[in-house]
Interface confidence: low
């Protein structure tokens, strides 16, 4: 039997060295001599010769100081062996504890934490963790941390507090204010010995910013503006208005968001915000004219891009401001309004009959006196222009259906100018009224009919005066001959079409058709056709056969 | 109304170090970005730094980059200018001025710095 | 950098009469230009702020007026109290001022 038992020793002992730490016995030193010897960590193995047993006594001794946070404890196994190298006893696995000092201090995992937090947030809102380590023995006082705030900057009042044992950092105060404070520094201290005076402690540093929410409205720097523009500009700035707002610069709790709330029913104005100064730019986007409004007041309001933060604010969300905007009149000239003006005359009017012409005036007077008329464009030369009332005389005849004419009105441009020069253009349309001067005619001239498949084709009229001279239309054969009346048949169909049909089976081959066409008035024309009685089943295939019956191609009778 | 007022100024040695202060009233000073421009003698105005309202951005011009430091104590409603390894071409009438938007709206009456041995 | 030179250097004019001062940006500074007014002894004042907008309380014979690089200030109408050294100061991108015209 071996008499030691497990033995301890306290690191960073300070000796004196050699450090009697136990005797090692063995039974069997009773019946032999016995010698002593021990063997592993700390003995033959690192850290070597930290240990030694005498051989004669067993005595177990320490040769120099040892740290706990490097080495534990040590297992190292003694042997009892008689001089001649006999083991009456089984080796001895010995422990020797090393017992710890508290000589680490807690270290904080950052020299600096930061952590970040929203103004106005509730009391208790978590800010951050802190932790600590310390190297001393675990699950002992030496390990047991206490922490605490022990400084803050700025330093009062006091806003935040630490649980003393997570770590946890909360808020002790709903009045964090961005706008008063954005950042505060704290000095923490962690301590171990669970926080008694006489244990070891460490500082670090907690820098805790404070984040902008929009618990500030911008506000009109005045509540009343005054600008002027001139009349019947457009798309110029007339004026910026500046606003104020606590919240964090260049973020949406700060940027402003413009409006107009009363006064631009017609859309005369916008306000938009400049991004880099965030000043309200009021524009003028439709002109305004000062002969209808001499002032106009608009009432702008601001808002920020973010949402107001405050809930049940007793103020209303938005601040306004009144702006004068007074309209400056312009001297501007004769005003062609409305820009298209329209008068009556009859065509094929005799020269010299004349009409009222366009009429421009001055809008601040609105009188037409000492303006002076001129023809800017006159497409056929049929009118002539009074310099002094703008009256026209006709120069030549009036054609309602001449080409240059649209849908009956003779369009010419006139040139208004006053006594200072200025001047504006506008356009007279002459609506021609029409006279009984065409006669009805058939514009299609050639007609081809393939026999047998087909018996007749339609012919159609036209009238170039207005409706009330032309259709319905009195179709009827022309020939003195009794050949073409033999041959044709005419019957009308509609008001302005007949259909002509051939009978008693003639020969294939062209022929003459004379044709007359009265309108409702009696005038009329003669028209002859062409009409091809051809060998085909359409049109497209009649290459003009001509009947064998009546040998060469001849033009048949009446042509 | 609002007021600026410098100090600070004096004479310095060549290498030396100076601190200037800037005391604001009369606004929200915490609301407000805040610069630092000087003027040489015979010379223009030259801007020197800028700080926002809140510290977070800081600018420096070129010719103090890394000798002068802006700083400011928005509850101490005071503007400062950190200045070190001064040269003769520091010598300058020193003003703070408020940023009203990205312009200077308000400025002090200024301090005098004189670099010389 | 934004270099901003000013012209001229110096002027003189008659009481009643009208002066113009000219800056020319490097490059474009999107109209954000300011107008200062220096005399001795006092900080500069702010006269015109975005090319062409008055300060309260600024007489209008001041008035601004430019675009992309090239910008003008006037004074109509001078007065005895209009002595003094003007500044214009692009502040764009950082700030830069002009070398200052002395009236």
């Known amino acids: 039997r071996w008499a030691p038992i497990p033995c301890s020793m306290l690191e960073n002992s300070l000796g004196p060295f050699p450090l009697f730490l136990q005797q090692v016995q063995s039974d069997t030193a009773q019946n032999y001599t016995i010698y002593y010897s021990i063997r592993g960590p700390g003995v033959d193995q690192e850290p070597r010769n930290l240990f030694y047993v005498e051989r004669d006594t067993g005595n177990l001794y320490c040769t120099r100081p040892v740290d706990r946070e490097q080495y534990e404890s040590f297992e190292i196994i003694a042997f009892a062996t008689t001089p001649d190298g006999y083991t009456p006893e089984l080796p001895l696995p010995l422990i020797i504890k090393i017992e710890d000092e508290n000589d680490n201090y807690p270290i904080f995992t950052e020299e600096t934490y930061t952590f970040t937090i929203f103004e106005n947030c509730r009391v208790g809102t978590t800010v951050g963790q802190v932790c600590a380590t310390d190297k001393d023995e675990p699950d002992t006082m030496h390990t047991r941390l206490k922490y605490s705030i022990i400084g803050q900057v700025p330093p009062s009042p006091t806003l935040f507090s630490m649980h003393p044992t997570t770590g946890v950092i909360t808020t002790t105060s709903s009045q964090l204010d961005r706008e008063l404070i954005d950042k505060y520094q704290l000095k923490i201290k962690v301590q171990d010995m669970d926080g008694q005076y006489f244990g070891l402690q460490t500082t670090s540093t907690c820098i805790i910013n404070i984040d902008d929410v929009n618990d500030h409205l911008p506000t009109f720097t005045r509540t009343s503006y005054v600008t002027s523009v001139e009349e019947n500009t457009v798309d110029v700035e007339i004026l910026r208005v500046t606003v104020e707002d606590k919240d964090l610069v260049n973020t949406a709790n700060w940027r402003a968001n413009y409006t107009i709330l009363k006064g631009n029913e017609n859309g005369n104005f916008k306000i938009v915000t400049d991004a880099k100064t965030n000043e309200g730019v009021l524009c003028v986007v439709k002109p305004l004219n000062y002969e209808e409004k001499q002032q106009m007041i608009l009432q702008i309001g601001v808002v920020n891009e973010a949402p107001f933060s405050r809930e049940a604010s007793p103020r209303s969300a938005m601040s306004t401001a009144t702006v004068t905007v007074n309209v400056e009149d312009q001297d501007e000239g004769p005003e062609c309004n409305p820009p298209i003006q329209t008068v009556r005359m009859k065509e094929n009017a005799e020269v010299g009959t004349t009409s009222n012409g366009y009429k421009a005036y001055d809008p601040e007077t609105r009188s037409s006196s000492g303006i002076r008329y001129k023809k800017l464009t006159d497409p056929t030369g049929w009118v002539t222009i009074d310099e002094n009332t703008g009256s026209i005389k006709v120069f030549r005849s009036l054609d309602r259906e001449a080409e240059t004419i649209k849908n009956g009105i003779y369009n010419i441009t006139v040139l208004a100018s006053d006594q200072g020069g200025r001047t504006c253009t506008g356009t007279l349309g002459i609506i021609l009224q029409d006279v009984n001067d065409n006669s009805p005619f058939i514009p299609k001239k050639t007609v081809i009919i393939c026999k047998p498949t087909m018996s007749s084709a339609e012919i159609v009229a036209v009238d170039p005066d207005e409706p009330i001279h032309g259709p319905p239309f009195d179709f009827s054969l022309e020939s003195s001959t009794s050949e073409v009346q033999r041959m044709w048949r005419l019957k009308a169909i509609n008001d302005t079409a007949a259909r002509l049909s051939y009978q008693n089976d003639p020969p294939f081959g062209s022929y003459v058709v004379p044709i007359t066409v009265r309108d409702r008035l009696g005038m009329s024309s003669v028209t002859s056709l062409d009409v091809t009685l051809c060998d085909c089943i359409t049109e497209n295939d009649c290459t003009h056969r001509v009947d064998p019956r009546i040998g060469g191609g001849g033009v048949q009778l009446g042509k | 109304d609002v007021q600026l007022v410098e100090s600070g100024g004096g004479l310095v040695q060549p290498g030396g170090s100076r601190k200037l202060s800037c005391a604001a009233s009369?606004?929200?000073?915490?609301?407000?970005?805040m610069h630092w421009v000087r003027q040489a003698p015979e010379k223009g105005l030259e801007w020197v730094a800028y700080?926002?309202?809140?510290?977070?951005?800081?600018y420096y011009a070129d010719t103090v980059k890394g000798r002068f430091t802006i700083s400011r104590d928005n509850p101490k409603n005071t503007l400062f200018l950190q200045m070190t390894s001064l040269r003769s071409e520091d010598t300058a009438m020193y003003y703070c001025?408020?940023?009203?938007?990205?312009?200077?709206?308000?400025w002090g009456q200024g301090t005098t710095l004189t670099v010389s041995s | 950098d934004i270099q901003m030179t000013q012209s001229p250097s110096s002027l003189s004019a008659s009481l009643g009469g009208k002066v113009t001062i000219t800056c020319k940006a490097s490059q474009d500074i999107n109209k954000y230009i300011a107008w200062y007014q220096h005399k001795p002894g006092k900080g500069p004042r702010l006269l015109i702020h975005?090319?062409?907008t008055l300060q309260p309380g600024i007489p209008s014979r001041f008035s601004g007026s430019g675009s992309g690089r090239d910008y003008s200030f006037s004074i109509s109408n001078l007065e005895p109290e209009d002595i003094a050294t003007y500044y214009c100061l692009q502040y764009d991108n950082l700030w830069t001022f002009g070398g200052g015209t002395k009236l």
């Open positions: 009369g606004f929200t000073f915490s609301s407000f970005g």
């Open positions: 001025a408020r940023v009203h938007y990205y312009y200077f709206d308000y």
């Open positions: 975005y090319t062409s």
């Open positions: 700080i926002s309202s809140g510290s977070s951005t800081i």
